[in-house]
């Protein structure tokens, strides 16, 4: 089944929408904004989402838009293209015509260009490391707890394969969650890091992606994990190109 | 094709611990999770806990936290669990399971673990 | 710990017969798995993610449900469907099971 068959809905995106209009009167779901369709049986790519989530009514976010001077990683939000496959292209350009290269997980990797900017390819991000705060707890998790719960919550919500979970660290209060995948590491059907990473982040954020499921409720033996920062790190198989300008 | 084979039938005492192994084939062994689990004469299927074959991270049930332990030898592609202090109400069928995207995939065929004095 | 708690625990039926089978949770999960299980045999998995069937296994079964309420049903029993059928969560640790509902024949 592509789509919860019942009430013709998208488990893993709620910024769909369906319709029993497949073949067979099965239900099909197209992501808003692209009105591409996705497999509501695995994640959504990021490209989609981000582009699902740029054309949602402004009026309909739920949270607050931090000030002009707040910090955001990189770019923050903007408008991606994505391929017939929903990855981001190399190359991405706004309305204006300033144009940049992308990674895999739609992070700038050059300073921005105009129109006859070249990006030959999309380079894999192979290595995410998640770094987390938690807030205060009566004492520190148990390290071997902590890891396995991170670790089974990839597995199950997010359907990311034990082997791109690399590495759990944890001293207290900071956690990191190491995620690499190579493209020869990466099968058909395997989920991406860069998409598990994303759908992450937003749960943390208390924005789930997924439908008619409940926030993320993380417990440790029972303890609520609760996490009041969160930033994330992304290597990219062949190094970005950005001006010594930039790096001063 | 994946196999999981455990080893066999095992009588110990109550007091005793007993080791119960799981050799895994077809498949890349650190890539994978083992899971342990139980089922008593006439019972139903009781989860023991899991072992992250790559890293080592090992997550047990409370009910069997300080009597159980579970490693891996990745040389042989062969997972282990070993219960101590046992008692009667251990008498049970362990079975081990890979894990990867689903909790339990590939099962093993079992192992009888009888506790009698 | 989330319990889990199957109804009914045994049932008769004849071939031929459509069954139900329904797996109540104590909270709410993610997804439903569905095994099967014969005398003196490992389980097998036959349904993951609630609906999806796993390689091998004949389309007369099938699952439903979401939140806490979670049905496995087979639409025209065989022979060879004559076993213990169990539900299972992993939504949270500890994973549990049901306790299993034992499916006779009349």
């Known amino acids: 089944h592509t789509a919860a068959q019942d009430n013709c809905t998208c488990p893993t995106n709620k910024m769909t929408v369906c319709s029993p209009d497949g073949p067979g009167g099965r239900c099909q779901c197209r992501a808003l904004g692209s009105g591409m369709a996705v497999d509501c049986s695995t994640l959504t790519s990021k490209c989609l989402l981000l582009k699902a989530r740029m054309s949602a009514p402004k009026n309909a976010r739920t949270l607050v838009r931090p000030s002009e001077h707040a910090l955001v990683d990189n770019d923050g939000l903007y408008d991606p293209d994505c391929d017939p496959e929903g990855r981001f292209k190399a190359r991405q350009c706004n309305q204006t015509s300033v144009c940049w290269c992308v990674n895999s997980v739609g992070v700038r990797r050059t300073d921005k260009g105009d129109l006859s900017l070249r990006c030959d390819e999309l380079v894999r991000t192979h290595h995410i490391l998640i770094d987390l705060r938690h807030r205060p707890t009566a004492g520190a998790f148990n390290h071997s707890d902590l890891d396995a719960e991170l670790r089974r919550l990839f597995r199950e919500r997010y359907r990311l394969h034990p082997k791109f979970v690399a590495a759990v660290h944890y001293e207290q209060p900071t956690i990191q969650i190491e995620l690499r995948q190579n493209t020869s590491q990466k099968a058909a059907g395997d989920v991406d890091i860069g998409d598990a990473a994303y759908y992450f982040e937003r749960d943390i954020k208390g924005e789930s992606l997924f439908q008619g499921r409940g926030g993320l409720d993380l417990r440790v033996r029972g303890e609520p994990l609760q996490v009041e920062r969160t930033l994330i790190y992304y290597l990219d198989e062949i190094p970005p190109k950005f001006s010594m300008k930039r790096l001063t | 094709e994946v196999q999981l084979v455990q080893s066999g039938p095992e009588v110990k005492k109550p007091g005793a611990s007993v080791k119960v192994s799981c050799k895994a084939s077809g498949f890349t062994f650190t890539d994978y999770v083992i899971g342990w689990v139980r089922q008593a004469p006439g019972q139903g299927l009781e989860w023991i806990g899991e072992?992250?074959?790559?890293?080592?991270?090992?997550y047990y049930t409370q009910k069997f936290k300080g009597r159980v332990t579970m490693t891996a030898d990745t040389s042989t592609s062969t997972a282990y669990m070993e219960l101590s202090s046992l008692r009667s109400e251990d008498t049970a069928v362990y079975y081990c399971?890979?894990?990867?995207?689903?909790?339990?995939?590939?099962w093993g065929q079992g192992t009888l673990v009888t506790v009698s004095s | 710990d989330i319990q889990l708690t199957q109804s009914p625990s045994s049932l008769s039926a004849s071939v031929g017969d459509r069954v139900t089978i329904t797996c109540s949770a104590s909270?709410?999960?993610?997804?439903m798995y569905w095994y099967q299980q014969k005398p003196g045999k490992a389980p097998k998995l036959l349904i993951y993610d609630t609906s999806t069937l796993q390689s091998g296994v004949p389309s007369r079964f099938s699952g439903s449900g979401s939140g806490t309420d979670f049905t496995l049903t087979i639409s025209s029993l065989q022979p060879e469907d004559f076993a213990t059928y169990y539900c299972q969560q992993w939504s949270s640790y500890p994973y549990t099971f049901g306790q299993g509902t034992k499916l006779e024949i009349k």
């Open positions: 909270s709410s999960v993610s997804y």
């Open positions: 072992i992250y074959l790559g890293s080592g991270t090992i």
């Open positions: 399971a890979r894990g990867s995207i689903f909790p339990f995939d590939y």
